[in-house]
Amino acid sequence: EKAMVDGSWLDLAKRSKLEAQPFAHLTINATDIPSGSHKVSLSSWYHDRGWAKISNMTFSNGKLIVNQDGFYYLYANICFRHHETSGDLATEYLQLMVYVTKTSIKIPSSHTLMKGGSTKYWSGNSEFHFYSINVGGFFKLRSGEEISIEVSNPSLLDPDQDATYFGAFKVRDID
């Protein structure tokens, strides 16, 4: 019987540790996409509606803030699209990029952790264009560090929650 109790307690301990594991999945706020044709920071994301969720991490001022030291898997998916009903592209040669950036407040510094994208020729003869970028990687993050997303040509972002999102989840502690 003691073994049973111990086993249940271990399960409970494991489960509560898992539940405390930080994670975030943030989806683009389509009502507040910035304008610009060069690299801009995306600061408006949902964290509590639709597919978006956050636990033991903080979302503030457009940045995902780490609350616990650890090794995290970071990911971002950015979709760009253009349909002729919205008008014409002023230029057919485009650089469509995403940058995942880490900012440290304690030692003021900023580093690009991941980038992805391509140059594209979106011909005016086509009715619809689409391009998707997915980046992901494993990083050591410290409490207080902030993760942010920058993109080129934000006016071409696909505003759907299944198209433009980013997130993180803790995989293990720092030994």
Partner: antibody, heavy 126, light 103 residues
Framework: QVQLVQSGAEVRKPGASVKVSCKAS????????IHWVRQAPGQRLEWMGW????????KFSQKFQGRITVTRDTAASTAYMELRSLRSEDTAVYYC???????????????????WGQGTLVTVSS | EIVMTQSPSSLSASVGDRVTITCRAS??????LNWYQLKPGKAPRLLIY???SLQSGVPSRFSGSGSGAEFTLTISSLQPEDIATYYC?????FGQGTKVEIK
């Protein structure tokens, strides 16, 4: 304030060419596109083409392809539309219009014509 | 190619009347629809863009609504200076116009 001032009325014979100018003032000319739209007597407005004043990129209606040239002089903040091989059905009032989309803020030419020139009457008659 | 169809082609109303003009697109155009006012010998004027956004400087008696393929321009209280021809427009396509006159 934003103003588009067009050149004066023109009379041409069939087969000739005409070049209409559109001088912009009151805004940064290079940051916007200029469209050309015409209206023949008793007809609806008809879009002809646009020029991105910043990079000189152009797009034209299939109907005018091969007959139309649109250029710009950024130093003079002026756009030009030349129509060749004129026929009597080209008799119309020709307008230039600014696209509302600022090219610094995005790269979509949205076809919202927020400011227009006063129009230039081109008469094609033998 | 998208075709824009306006109705009616002309209308006559009294000062103070509520006037409604309809514009239909041959396929869905979301909310990418603009309205212009044209008076003889004057530069056209943008009234409404994006189906319902009032252009700066345009009197609030003008309003726009609709999405998809059906749109309306409403003048809540017709004024003598509103005598003009009104055009709807989606990108490269214009409606045939609606001439508004005073009774």
């Amino acid at each position: 304030q934003v103003q588009l001032v067009q050149s004066g009325a023109e009379v041409r014979k069939p087969g000739a060419s005409v070049k209409v100018s559109c001088k912009a003032s009151g805004y940064d000319f290079s940051n916007y596109a200029i469209h050309w739209v015409r209206q023949a007597p008793g007809q609806r407005l008809e879009w002809m083409g646009w020029i991105n004043a910043g990079n000189g990129n152009t797009k034209f209606s299939q109907k005018f392809q091969g007959r139309i040239t649109v250029t710009r002089d950024t130093a003079a903040s002026t756009a030009y539309m030349e129509l060749r091989s004129l026929r009597s059905e080209d008799t119309a009032v020709y307008y230039c219009a600014r696209d509302q989309s600022n090219m610094v803020r995005g790269i979509i030419i949205a076809y919202y014509f927020d400011y227009w020139g006063q129009g230039t009457l081109v008469t094609v008659s033998s | 190619e998208i075709v824009m169809t306006q109705s009616p082609s002309s209308l006559s109303a009294s000062v103070g009347d509520r006037v409604t003009i309809t514009c239909r697109a041959s396929q869905s155009i979301s909310r990418y629809l603009n309205w212009y006012q044209l008076k003889p010998g004057k530069a056209p004027r943008l009234l409404i863009y994006g189906a319902s956004s009032l252009q700066s400087g345009v009197p609030s008696r003008f309003s726009g609504s609709g999405s998809g393929a059906e749109f309306t321009l409403t003048i809540s209280s017709l004024q003598p200076e509103d005598i003009a021809t009104y055009y709807c427009q989606h990108t490269r396509a214009f409606g045939q116009g609606t001439k508004v006159e005073i009774k």
